[in-house]
């Protein structure tokens, strides 16, 4: 997976968990086991 910033500690930590990357109007967000807070 890829995070928009390697400084995003949470993204880097969770990104291996079968995350599928999807585009939103604002930015790229992860959607995996659950979902990012809307």
């Amino acid at each position: 997976c890829s995070c928009s910033s390697l400084m995003d500690k949470e993204c880097v930590y969770f990104c291996h968990l079968d995350i599928i990357w999807v585009n939103t109007p604002e930015h790229v967000v992860p959607y995996g086991l659950g979902s990012p807070r809307s």
Epitope: E10, F14, G32, L33, R37
Partner: antibody, heavy 118, light 108 residues
Framework: EVQLVESGGGLVKPGGSLRLSCAAS????????MNWVRQAPGKGLEWVSS????????YYADSVKGRFTISRDNAKNSLYLQMNSLRAEDTAVYYC???????????WGQGTLVTVSS | EIVLTQSPGTLSLSPGERATLSCRAS???????LAWYQQKPGQAPRLLIY???SRATGIPDRFSGSGSGTDFSLTISRLEPEDFALYYC?????????FGGGTKVEIK
């Protein structure tokens, strides 16, 4: 000293709701990812849900997805689990656990018992 | 879902003996994502090992973890009376996070 104290468990009828709380102390709560793990009577451990430190990433086990909601209030050093549409198979001791940023849970509360029965 | 199979289900040993517990994954798990916990009756689990082989804070050096891929193990070099308990492995490498079924280490 790190402490996690769960509350809110009890007896509820099938289809009912409960809200569990976990009060954290002894560490900077807002810096840690948190989790709920449950254990049915006489059974093994089952991961329920995870929430990242800022609440940006929220994950659920398939068995609870759509029925349970995890949340946190960093200002109150508290973790929550809203449980709706409860089923008999949700009967368990529910533990909150701190994720230590090493892909494991280094501190656990003592648990709160949820019993779903008519 | 990664299924973790622990064996044996029960291990009957005497204090001072060596205990070797196995955790086999249904698919490969990076060693970074494998942990071991101890649980005693009526108590919450306690983290022993993370990253397959790193001891958690305060864990005695008689506990050691090893393994990679699909086969992991927890070794207790010399059993102390307080070590008789349930032991669980857990993987954090794939969704959902899963625990093994546990191994009970009992006094022979």
């Amino acid at each position: 000293e790190v402490q996690l104290v769960e509350s809110g468990g009890g007896l509820v009828k099938p289809g009912g709701s409960l809200r569990l709380s976990c009060a954290a102390s002894g560490f900077t709560f807002s810096s840690y990812n948190m989790n709920w793990v449950r254990q049915a009577p006489g059974k093994g451990l089952e991961w329920v849900s995870s929430i990242s430190s800022s609440s940006s990433y929220i994950y659920y086990a398939d068995s609870v997805k759509g029925r349970f909601t995890i949340s946190r209030d960093n200002a109150k050093n508290s973790l929550y689990l809203q449980m709706n549409s409860l089923r008999a198979e949700d009967t368990a001791v529910y533990y909150c656990a701190r994720d230590n940023w090493n892909y494991s849970f280094d501190y656990w509360g003592q648990g709160t018992l949820v019993t779903v029965s008519s | 879902e990664i299924v973790l199979t622990q064996s044996p289900g029960t291990l009957s040993l005497s204090p001072g003996e060596r205990a070797t517990l196995s955790c086999r994954a249904s698919q490969s798990v990076s060693s970074s994502y494998l942990a071991w916990y101890q649980q005693k009756p009526g108590q919450a689990p306690r983290l022993l090992i993370y990253g397959a082989s790193s001891r958690a804070t305060g864990i005695p050096d008689r506990f050691s973890g090893s393994g990679s891929g699909t086969d992991f193990s927890l070794t207790i070099s010399r059993l102390e009376p307080e070590d008789f308990a349930l032991y669980y492995c857990q993987q954090y490498g794939s969704s959902p996070l899963t625990f093994g079924g546990g191994t009970k280490v009992e006094i022979k």
